[in-house]
């Protein structure tokens, strides 16, 4: 190899060992029989050399640094050349460095031809190995503006007082042009301006100077976004830290076209603007930091540009002013991440504060709109607490558990509406009465409606799930001893049409000791399947549950258990089942941890089934499934 550098070219070539690999054998640069580990070639020198190994690219890197002095004479503006040409260099990983020094009053602009640049964060690398590292200068301090790959949106970077640009090319890369030019500008009066151009839909992730380290104290950095007028942009902060300010406040400022309040000032912890039409600027302003404990200011943010949706111009009013203890959250439904660009899906409050999720609270009227290509990507979860603190006031009081129509009119699917029903301990219990009798969801007879009610204990220490219930069954009411949550969960968009079938009334009733009582009035047409609460996990220790099963005068009920034995093994106490005729009070008692379960039995009158658990050994839980079938009495059962 021969490298000859013209005089006065201000170029230095350095060939040095790269990051040591686990290669056992060394490799040397050989110059007139001397083996050396580093070679420096300066302007005006010509050096002939070879390598002592077959694959020097595994060992050595080459740095070509050109110093451009704009202080003492005119600046060589225009397209920047790769000198010496890559074809004259050994095939090593190459880094071309341009170090431009200029007066504070002179602005320098790096212009990147297509493909534009994409900023990467710490630990990230570029797919093709080509990286652009750009740094600026504040007095004698070097400031890292960022590291960039190809195929992005960054088209121009303006700085003053000097710029250092390093272009790293892997040894196998054929690139032979720098891909950028330098122009002079008037002073920009800030650290730098980064211009990001969007041709169509897309996203860009950008970072404050020196990220992830601290942004220089009391500095100003601006990003200019060029967005076609027919598209909308939204900003979201992915990561930020605030320093400890002694004077002034750290903030971001937006210059938004059409805004009457430019610049719009936001704290970093605020929700950032969304749904912006056309070009806009974002500036990060630091503060005077506390000398003793400065902390660090840093920011990583994303700009998402997409087509406005029809919905984005529609305002929805959610009136929660008459509600109490209620919160409504609109959020993305969980989906598998895809690798291709996915337009953002935002919900906006007052059209401007957009984010991927939004929580509205009771006591106010809220105006919301959507910035989303497909509203099925969002769903709604609502929580409402109905509590009784004074048992004398609440007793016999009823509340309707119904989804307010305001919520049903939103263009987003309701996922869960949860009512937390709270009663004073050992004073009151609850009864749930559905508008339409309920069916318990079982494997044998699953619910196929567009919604279900999930009933569970709301006592933190108690793991008790009564089950999932849907309209169209035989359960007339459910009584529960203490605090519960009732969740209306929807399973299909058709819930909007079936919403009229929802309707559940809760009443506060005198306290009773059983964990739950189900009142069942079977229809003659179908088999009713019932199962113990906490199916699959087992009825909790020492819990008692009852079913009050009505048998019409002209019918006979067949009670069938689906197992021969309960399978429960008691550690302490006994597990038993009582089947009691309501008219005669005659009862049969079965020891669930010893006896076999009863064979199918026939009941001419209404009866009770009561199941009480012991403290079971782990893994030997109590789970029972039984059915009730009515047949006319005229049939000879013998």
């Amino acid at each position: 190899f021969e490298i000859a550098l013209p005089r006065e070219s201000n170029i230095t070539v350095l060939i040095k060992l790269g990051t040591p690999t686990l290669l056992a054998k060394p490799c040397y640069i050989v110059i007139s029989k001397r083996h050396i580990t580093m070679l420096s070639i300066k302007s005006g020198e010509r050096i002939v050399f070879t390598f002592s190994c077959q694959s020097p690219e595994n060992h050595f890197v080459i740095e070509i640094q050109k110093n451009i002095d704009c202080m003492s004479g005119p600046c060589p503006f225009g397209e920047v050349q790769l000198q010496p040409s890559t074809s004259l260099l050994p095939t090593l990983n190459r880094t071309f460095i341009w170090d431009v020094k200029a007066h504070k009053s002179i602005g320098l602009e790096l212009q990147f031809s297509i493909p534009r640049l994409r900023q990467i964060g710490p630990g990230e690398s570029c797919p093709d190995g080509v990286t652009h590292s750009i740094s600026g200068r504040i007095d004698a301090t070097v400031v890292r503006i960022g590291t960039f790959c190809s195929n992005g949106t960054v088209s121009r970077i303006k700085m003053q007082e000097g710029v250092k640009m390093a272009l790293h090319l892997p040894w196998f890369h054929p690139r032979n042009v720098s891909g950028f030019s330098i122009a002079n500008r008037s002073s920009i009066k800030r650290l730098c301006i980064i211009e990001s151009v969007f041709e169509g839909e897309g996203s860009a992730t950008l970072m404050s100077a020196n990220y992830p380290e601290g942004f220089p104290e009391d500095e100003l950095m601006t990003w200019q976004f060029v967005v076609p007028a027919h598209l909308r942009a939204s900003v979201s902060f992915l990561n930020f830290n605030l320093s400890n300010c002694e004077r002034k406040e750290e903030r971001v400022e937006y210059y938004i076209p059409g805004s009457t309040t430019n610049p719009e000032v936001f704290k970093l912890e605020d929700k950032q603007p969304g749904n912006m039409a056309g070009n806009f600027n974002l500036s990060l302003q630091g503060c005077d930091q506390d000398a003793q404990s400065p902390g660090i200011l840093r920011l990583q943010f994303q700009v998402l540009v997409q087509h406005p949706q029809n919905e984005s111009n529609k305002i929805y009013v959610v009136d929660l002013s008459n509600e109490r203890a209620m919160s409504l959250t609109i959020e993305p439904r969980p989906v598998k991440q895809s690798r291709k660009f996915v337009p953002g899906c935002f919900v906006c409050l007052e059209s401007r504060t957009c984010s991927s999720n939004l929580t509205l609270t009771s006591g106010s009227k809220h105006k919301i709109s959507f910035l989303c290509d497909d509203l099925t990507r969002l769903w709604m979860n609502v929580e409402k607490t109905i509590s009784c603190t004074d048992h004398r006031y609440c007793q016999r009081k009823s509340y309707s558990l119904q989804v307010p129509s305001d919520i049903l009119h939103l263009p987003v699917e309701l996922h869960d509406f949860s009512w937390k029903l709270l009663v004073p301990k050992d004073r009151l219990s609850l009864v749930l009465v559905p508008a339409q009798k309920l069916q318990q969801h079982t494997h044998e007879k699953p619910c196929n409606t567009s919604f279900s009610y999930l009933v569970a204990s709301a006592i933190p220490s108690q793991d008790l799930y009564f089950g999932s219930f849907c309209p169209g069954g035989s359960i007339k009411q459910i009584q529960v001893k203490q605090n519960i949550s009732v969740t209306l969960r929807t399973f299909a968009p058709s819930f909007q049409q079936e919403a009229s079938r929802q309707g559940l009334t809760v009443s506060f009733i005198p306290y009773f000791k059983e964990e739950g009582v189900f009142t069942v009035t079977p229809d003659t047409k179908s088999k009713v399947y019932l199962r113990t609460p906490n199916w699959d996990r087992g009825l909790p220790s020492l819990t008692s549950v009852s079913w009050n099963i009505s048998v019409p005068r002209d019918q006979v009920a067949c009670l069938t258990f689906f197992k021969e034995r309960s399978g429960v093994v008691c550690q302490t106490g006994r597990a038993f089942m009582i089947i009691q005729e309501q008219r005669t009070r005659a009862e049969e008692i079965f020891s669930l941890d010893e006896d076999v379960l009863p064979k199918p039995s026939f009941h001419h009158h209404s009866f009770w089934v009561n199941i009480s658990n012991c403290s079971p050994t782990s893994g030997k839980q109590l789970d029972l499934l039984f059915s009730v079938t009515l047949t006319p009495r005229t049939v000879d059962l013998t």
Epitope: K16, L17, L23, A24, K25, Y28, R34, H35, I36, T37
Partner: antibody, heavy 119, light 107 residues
Framework: EVQLQQSGAELVRPGALVKLSCKAS????????IHWVKQRPEQGLEWIGW????????IYDPKFQGKASITADTSSNTAYLQLSSLTSEDTAVYYC????????????WGQGTSVTVSS | DIVMTQSHKFMSTSVGDRVSITCKAS??????VAWYQQKSGQSPKLLIY???TRHTGVPDRFTGSGSGTDYTLTISSVQAEDLALYYC?????????FGGGTKLEIK
């Protein structure tokens, strides 16, 4: 475990030649450079040269050119240093050492072979 | 050839003291400097390479520093077992050359 086992001490007449061996274990000499270093009694270290055992390529300090000859036998994983036309100036301890492409320094050394040139 | 000069042939120190052994190259060797320790009757052992990288198994009281032509080996808290000869060596260019050595003596 990486080891370089050198041959035993030699007492030789002036004008004679001597061949010292350095047997490697725990690594393959083909993958490393093997260096030889001289240390005269109560003196410092002097680098003699190296061999790339894979291709037999050698480099010497010019002052040992003609005096020292470094060879290697990859089948026995052994490097050799031959010293010719011995004089009392060659009385020294001779060390072999290996050099890697990570450290570019001699990371493991043999225990040394003492050569005494005396009539 | 590059000449490596260790100006102190002997250095006297006490257990627990901090000691710095210096080495000067006759030209810029771009941090291609190694330090070796040789105890009496033993072969040399590599301590530091590339001026500041500690070899595996070397206690962290040994640190190397320097650039250009001036290099230093520092022992932050001398132990009795550190009594030895210390050599610097440039691995920048052949022929490799060693310093004359510095003998560390314990008072």
């Amino acid at each position: 475990e990486v080891q370089l086992q050198q041959s035993g001490a030699e007492l030789v007449r002036p004008g004679a030649l001597v061949k010292l061996s350095c047997k490697a274990s725990g690594f393959n000499i083909k993958d490393y450079y093997i260096h030889w270093v001289k240390q005269r009694p109560e003196q410092g270290l002097e680098w003699i040269g190296w061999i790339d055992p894979e291709n037999g390529h050698t480099i010497y300090d010019p002052k040992f050119q003609g005096k020292a000859s470094i060879t290697a036998d990859t089948s026995s994983n052994t490097a050799y240093l031959q010293l010719s036309s011995l004089t009392s100036e060659d009385t020294a301890v001779y060390y072999c050492a290996r050099l890697t492409g990570t450290t570019y320094a001699m990371d493991y050394w043999g225990q040394g072979t003492s050569v005494t040139v005396s009539s | 050839d590059i000449v490596m000069t260790q100006s102190h042939k002997f250095m006297s120190t006490s257990v627990g003291d901090r000691v710095s052994i210096t080495c000067k190259a006759s030209q810029d060797v771009s941090t291609a400097v190694a330090w070796y320790q040789q105890k009496s009757g033993q072969s040399p052992k590599l301590l530091i390479y590339w001026a500041s990288t500690r070899h595996t198994g070397v206690p962290d009281r040994f640190t190397g520093s320097g650039s250009g032509t001036d290099y230093t080996l520092t022992i932050s808290s001398v132990q009795a077992e550190d009594l030895a000869l210390y050599y610097c060596q440039q691995h920048y260019s052949t022929p490799y050359t060693f310093g004359g050595g510095t003998k560390l003596e314990i008072k």
